[in-house]
């Protein structure tokens, strides 16, 4: 039984981190334009990995794909890679966890074979988890570098008459998001490699034994016979609750109620 | 078509307070931005800030901070502008008019209200 | 505050020439997001209230005559008027729309001969 609840507890923190993977990843708000300690814009910068947006302060939203790959720097196009295989190697370890859980009976496969699945999708959720990590913190990091020359260039002065303020970006919330479902992702995938040692079915090899009573000639073997949770267990309705996870496009939205400029 | 309607001309006295009056036909006020400035002979256009309407978000030109308060009714589709202890610095026509929704800029602009101030 | 420089202060020319006026500001108003310099240009006749013309410094307002220009990028720009007529007569004003508090030039005052 605890097992049955490990696998299945284990699938349902990946898919939930998959999800969030392939959110994070589709989401624009990497990086965010910095308003801390910068002159106030009536427009908002914001990037993702596939797209730039501009928010003006009238509501209007323009957003321009990065229609170029050449073009592009070598650690978004990293990132990118990641984040994908990340995806691909969730989606097909979701798949293969589909018929490694326990509670699903599919012909006559074997506990082995399904424990030996559990483990292969463990794995690869490890994997899926780790890569969506280490993508969020590339990015965050390139952002952390990028910061921090910007501010020290902030001001690049033509002659000392016209100052060109640079735009700054900070974290996004798909970085959080990301870190959060590549965590998850990560969970998922050891919750099933450690429902995968419960599966696998241990080898007990019992000798069989023969009583001789008198007139009958009976031998007793006793099969190794194992405690099972049968298909149709007493598992109760268990409602998820989802938070209805927003993705946040009014980053900006001017702070405070009463602003002076 | 989209229309802002403001009073013709108040005249006050110094020390007084004034509420001018925006009135926006041809569409509803709510999502939009209403823009407040002035304009003196000798001192050009001045942007006292903006109320967004629907959400009560409010900016304000740091200059005219304790000089200007924005309100809004959206029942009659109307924007306010309160301005209180008036001086004769104050003279000036008002505007009101409507960020547009591109390029943060004023599209529809009201006639002007003319305020005198004067003892 | 961002500080918008218009010259000339005013110009006289007969209907038909070819105009110019410049907008400086004291920062660039080019966001690097889109690469839009968010500048707009207003025609105020006398007695009425300003009209936008111009917004990201180069895109006409619809219904405005081709014959009105803007151009330029990051803190100068440029009013082309191609060929004025008389009813251009009017004072023409460029305003930063990209850093709050929003500012406005002091104008140039078109008069025709």
């Known amino acids: 039984m605890a097992v049955t609840a490990c696998q299945g507890l284990g699938f349902v923190v990946s898919l939930i981190g998959i999800a969030g993977i392939i959110a994070a990843t589709c989401m624009d708000q990497w990086s965010t334009q910095d308003l801390y300690n910068n002159p106030v814009t009536a427009v908002f910068n914001y990037q993702g990995l596939w797209r730039s947006c501009v928010r003006e302060s009238s509501g209007f939203t323009e957003c321009r794909g990065y229609f170029t790959l050449l073009g592009l720097p070598a650690m978004l196009q990293a990132v990118r890679a990641l984040m994908i295989v990340g995806i691909v190697l969730g989606a097909i370890g979701l798949l293969v966890s589909i018929f490694a859980l326990k509670c699903i009976r599919i012909g006559s496969m074997e506990d082995s074979a399904k424990a030996n699945m559990t483990l292969t999708s463990g794995i690869m959720f490890i994997v899926s988890g780790l890569c969506a990590i280490a993508g969020v913190s590339v990015f965050a990091n390139m952002l952390v570098t990028n910061f921090w020359m910007s501010t020290a260039n902030m001001y690049t002065g033509m002659g000392g008459m016209v100052q060109t303020v640079q735009t700054r970006y900070t974290f996004g919330a798909a970085l959080f998001v990301g870190w959060v479902a590549g965590g998850l992702t990560l969970i998922g995938g050891v919750m099933m490699c450690i429902a995968c040692r419960g599966l696998a079915p241990e080898e007990t090899n019992y000798k069989a034994v023969s009583y001789h009573a008198s007139g009958h000639s009976v031998a007793y073997k006793p099969g190794g016979f194992k405690a099972s949770t049968g298909f149709g267990s007493n598992t109760k309705n268990k409602k998820i609750y989802d938070g209805g996870a927003r993705t946040e496009d009014e980053v900006q939205s001017y702070p405070s109620k009463h602003d002076y400029v | 078509q989209v229309q802002l309607q403001q009073s013709g001309a108040e005249l006050m006295k110094p020390g007084a307070s004034v509420k001018l009056p925006c009135k926006a036909s041809g569409y509803t006020l709510t999502g939009y931005w209403i823009e407040w400035l002035k304009q003196r002979p000798r001192h050009g256009l001045e942007w006292i800030g903006e109320?967004?309407?629907?959400?009560?978000?409010?900016k304000y030109n740091v200059k005219f901070k304790d000089k200007a308060t924005f309100t809004a009714d959206t029942s009659s589709n109307t924007a306010y502008m309160q301005l209180n202890s008036l001086t004769t610095e104050d003279s000036a026509i008002y505007y009101c008019?409507?960020?547009?929704?591109?390029?943060?800029?004023?599209?529809?602009w009201g006639q002007g209200t003319t305020l005198t101030v004067s003892s | 505050d961002i500080v918008m420089t218009q010259s000339p202060s005013s110009l006289t020319v007969t209907a038909g020439e070819k105009v110019t006026m410049s907008c400086k500001s004291s920062q660039s108003l080019l966001n690097s997001g889109n690469q839009k310099s968010y500048l707009t240009w207003y025609q105020q006749k006398p007695g009425q209230p300003p009209k936008r013309l111009i917004y990201?410094?180069?895109t006409r307002e619809s219904g405005v005559p081709d014959r009105f220009t803007g151009s330029g990028s990051g803190t100068d720009f440029t009013l082309t008027i191609s060929s004025v007529q008389a009813e251009d007569l009017a004072v023409y004003y460029c305003q930063n729309d990209y850093y709050y508090p929003f500012t406005f030039g002091s104008g140039t005052k078109l008069e025709i001969k």
């Open positions: 109320i967004l309407l629907g959400s009560g978000s409010i």
């Open positions: 990201w410094a180069s």
């Open positions: 008019a409507r960020k547009g929704l591109r390029g943060n800029s004023f599209d529809y």
